[in-house]
């Protein structure tokens, strides 16, 4: 499956949509910024095999999809942009799932992968907790939007893993 190409294209589209979704000036939200501790160092220090990269990226996109599919999210963003963004994420999930099926039979280290997936889940838990604590304020959503854009850009090592032949 030609995942690096399609994922890169969809990722760019998702980023552009996310960029367009901004509703308020982020400069009015400087005091609300928060460190969510994206597990960048864990990812950077690891050479991902293709199946590992797929499953961790799938988890990241799934968690992002869940985050932006809530009622609170629907109230925060312009509906048509949110729908386009969700559709883009859904397509990415489908692409990744199709690739997993093609990659069956490839050896994997499940325990190591579980650690990365757990790190991603904890990261999104921190984001959800922050939104709850901030009562889903417009500034809280703006901070989260910037964080998700950054996490999409951060996962370069995962994308390198997609190009690898297992």
């Amino acid at each position: 499956c030609d995942l690096p190409q399609t994922h890169s294209l969809r990722n760019r589209r998702a980023l552009i949509l996310l960029a367009q979704m901004g509703r308020i000036s982020p400069f009015s939200c400087l005091k609300d910024r928060h460190e969510f501790r994206f597990p960048e160092e864990e990812f950077d220090g690891h050479q991902f095999q293709k199946t590992q990269a797929i499953s961790v990226l799938h988890e990241m996109i799934q968690q992002t999809f869940n985050l932006f599919s809530t009622e609170d999210s629907s109230a925060a963003w312009e509906q048509s942009l949110l729908e386009k963004f969700s559709t883009e994420l859904y397509q990415q999930l489908n692409d990744l799932e199709a690739c997993v099926i093609q990659e069956v039979g490839v050896e994997e280290t499940p325990l190591m992968n579980e650690d990365f997936i757990l790190a991603v889940r904890k990261y999104f838990q921190r984001i959800t907790l922050y939104l709850m604590e901030k009562k889903y304020s417009p500034c809280a959503w703006e901070v989260v939007r910037a964080e998700i854009m950054r996490s999409f850009s951060f996962s370069t090592n995962l994308k390198k893993g997609l190009r690898r032949k297992d």
């Epitope: 552009i16 960029a19 367009q20 000036s25 400069f27 005091k31 910024r33 928060h34 501790r37 950054r150």
Partner: antibody, heavy 120, light 111 residues
Framework: QVQLQESGTVLARPGASVKMSCKAS????????MHWVKQRPGQGLEWIGV????????TYNQKFKDKAKLTAVTSANTAYMELSSLTNEDSAVYFC?????????????WGQGTTVTVSS | DIVLTQSPASLAVSLGQRATISCRAS??????????MHWYQQKPGQTPKLLIY???NLESGVPARFSGSGSGTDFTLNIHPVEEEDAATYYC?????????FGSGTKLEIK
């Protein structure tokens, strides 16, 4: 690769206005904030303001809000800064710079600078 | 406005030694785990170059001899071991609140 190409040297009279340009290439122009920074000869750096080309949103340093006007034309991938009511204090090099890492608000790529000289 | 005071204004360091540049903010630029302080290098006739962001994160492609530390109001840029090509002016910049401001610069000379 990312490039920011600024317009050339400008010589202007006191009281006049000048408009300088910054043409971006190598990245998605509409999805990155663009900062403008001033540097007087032999001196430090001053942040003027920032524009989001995607929707034209601007935020200014209050010190420059009556001096500088930031605009962008997305079809040309170009950001502009207009300086009005020029005085000798406005003689400086002006840089356009791309915002980096979203809300960290640091600057990764810089244009080569436009030199403005105000003289009668 | 937050004032950033850099010291020293200039320093001369021998090749291979350590250069330490300080930047003090008139108000804290740290919130919730991040310190919004960044460092740039500007060589004569060139544009500034980002070295360090968020107080201690090394920008991609910047040599590991550059390091940043600090939080709240006190920040430091260290260069060790200093090389000839490090002769430049170094600026700190904060993005803690509006307006963003820069320090007045520290000129590093290599002996």
């Amino acid at each position: 690769q990312v490039q920011l190409q600024e317009s050339g040297t400008v010589l202007a009279r006191p009281g006049a206005s000048v408009k300088m340009s910054c043409k971006a290439s190598g990245y998605s122009f509409t999805t990155y904030w663009m900062h403008w920074v001033k540097q007087r000869p032999g001196q430090g750096l001053e942040w003027i303001g920032v524009i989001y080309p995607g929707n034209g949103d601007t935020t200014y340093n209050q010190k420059f809000k009556d001096k500088a006007k930031l605009t962008a034309v997305t079809s040309a991938n170009t950001a502009y800064m207009e300086l009005s009511s020029l005085t000798n204090e406005d003689s400086a090099v002006y840089f356009c710079t791309r915002n980096y890492k979203y809300d960290y608000y640091t600057m990764d790529y810089w244009g080569q600078g436009t030199t403005v000289t105000v003289s009668s | 406005d937050i004032v950033l005071t850099q010291s020293p204004a200039s320093l001369a360091v021998s090749l291979g030694q350590r250069a330490t540049i300080s930047c003090r903010a008139s108000k804290s630029v740290s919130t919730s785990g991040h310190s919004y302080m960044h460092w740039y290098q500007q060589k004569p006739g060139q544009t500034p170059k980002l070295l360090i962001y968020l107080a201690s994160n090394l920008e991609s492609g910047v040599p590991a001899r550059f390091s940043g530390s600090g939080s709240g109001t006190d920040f430091t840029l260290n260069i060790h071991p200093v090389e000839e090509e490090d002769a430049a002016t170094y600026y700190c910049q904060h993005s803690g609140e509006l307006p963003f401001t820069f320090g007045s610069g520290t000129k590093l000379e290599i002996k």
